[in-house]
């Protein structure tokens, strides 16, 4: 049964150039997380962080990618191009797969904020 | 290239206890978790059990709990299917299978060891 | 359990066509199914996971779609090759269940 919730960072925006912190939280449920996903619209995959091997962060991503805080995911240099979906996965036991999906928007505009609905510390 | 070799299967009285092996060639074991998967002589597939990367983390269904154990040894590019208690209907086909490193599915099979359960 | 319904078990075609293969999940389970092919003395091989991505090294040819209980599988221009066994399994919650099949056979 599966009775967790996923709370995310929700509707984000951040400047060009700058960076952004990805999270996810996942609560309701005492399953346990053995790993958890980051992808991006198109399906690719940033990142891995799996309980017993850590962080993978696939190559592409290797340069502007950066593991946390926690289970999150920190975006740097951002382009206009990551503009976009952006999907967590958590894997659990014996729940499953939960999804938590973040909109990120990257603004030329140097009044861009980064806006969060939570923080986990 | 990406092999897995079951090994082990027979024939086995009710009640008996039967040890399972699957050797693993061509990819970096210890990075991939991996699963157990048998087909029944109807031709049905059912997940049997799953062990981590590490091997901290088994699961199994209901059908196989406390009857099955999980295990491998990462050293050895070995896994195991450890059954007890075995019954008619655990007669099939064994297959073991590799995770993809996202978790998503199995993306590599063996071609399986045959278990037959009868007296 | 997530129960999943396959259909049609058996199905008859010829090479050139196209044909589609379904499974209904007993509830949703998001867009985790995949599918794989059996083919008598070689390996299971994953085709499609997450409902729609395709299996690296699989010809485009084979497409998935579907999310919540709904799933097809779609094999264009049918190739000699192809005529298998073929399986969904869904990846969304423990246990890890499997549709009964569909036997795909030269009409």
């Known amino acids: 049964m599966m009775t967790g919730t996923i709370e995310t960072t929700g509707n984000i925006s951040a400047k060009k150039g700058g960076s952004v912190i990805l999270q996810c939280h996942l609560s309701s449920t005492m399953a346990q997380v053995t790993q958890v996903n980051w992808e991006q619209h198109d399906h690719s995959l940033l990142a891995i962080r799996n309980a017993e091997l850590g962080w993978h962060i696939y190559p592409a991503f290797k340069d502007r990618v950066a593991p946390g805080p926690g289970l999150g995911l920190t975006l740097q240099s951002l382009t206009m191009n990551d503009t976009g979906e952006y999907f967590c996965t958590y894997h659990t036991y014996p729940d499953g797969t939960y999804r938590g999906r973040i909109f990120l928007e990257v603004l030329e505009s140097s009044v861009a904020e980064h806006s969060a609905r939570f923080q986990i510390p | 290239e990406v092999q897995l070799v079951e090994s082990g299967g027979g024939l086995v009285k009710p009640g008996g206890s039967l040890k399972l092996s699957c050797a693993a060639s061509?990819?970096?074991?210890?990075?991939?978790?991996m699963s157990w998967v048998r087909q029944s002589p109807e031709k049905r597939l059912e997940w049997v059990a799953e062990?981590?990367?590490?091997?901290?983390?088994?699961y199994y269904p209901d059908t196989v709990t406390g009857r099955f154990t999980i295990s491998r040894d990462n050293a050895k590019n070995t896994l195991y299917l450890e059954m007890s208690s075995l019954r008619s209907e655990d007669t099939a086909m064994y297959y073991c299978a590799r995770k993809r490193r996202d978790y998503y599915a199995m993306d590599y099979w063996g071609q399986g060891t045959s278990v037959t359960v009868s007296s | 359990d997530v129960q999943i319904t396959q259909s049609p078990s058996y199905l008859a075609a010829s090479p050139g066509e196209t044909i589609t293969i379904n499974c209904r999940a007993s509830k949703s389970i998001s867009k985790y199914l995949a599918w794989y092919q059996e083919k008598p003395g070689k390996t299971n091989k994953l085709l499609i996971y997450s409902g729609s991505t395709l299996q690296s090294g699989i010809p485009s040819r084979f497409s998935g779609s579907g999310s919540g209980t709904d799933f097809t599988l779609t094999i264009s221009s049918l190739e000699p090759e192809d005529f298998a066994m073929y399986y969904c399994?869904?990846?969304?919650?423990?246990?890890?269940?499997f549709g009964g099949g569909t036997k795909l056979e030269i009409k």
């Open positions: 062990i981590s990367s590490g091997g901290s983390y088994t």
């Open positions: 061509g990819f970096t074991f210890s990075s991939y978790a």
């Open positions: 399994q869904q990846h969304n919650e423990y246990p890890w269940t």
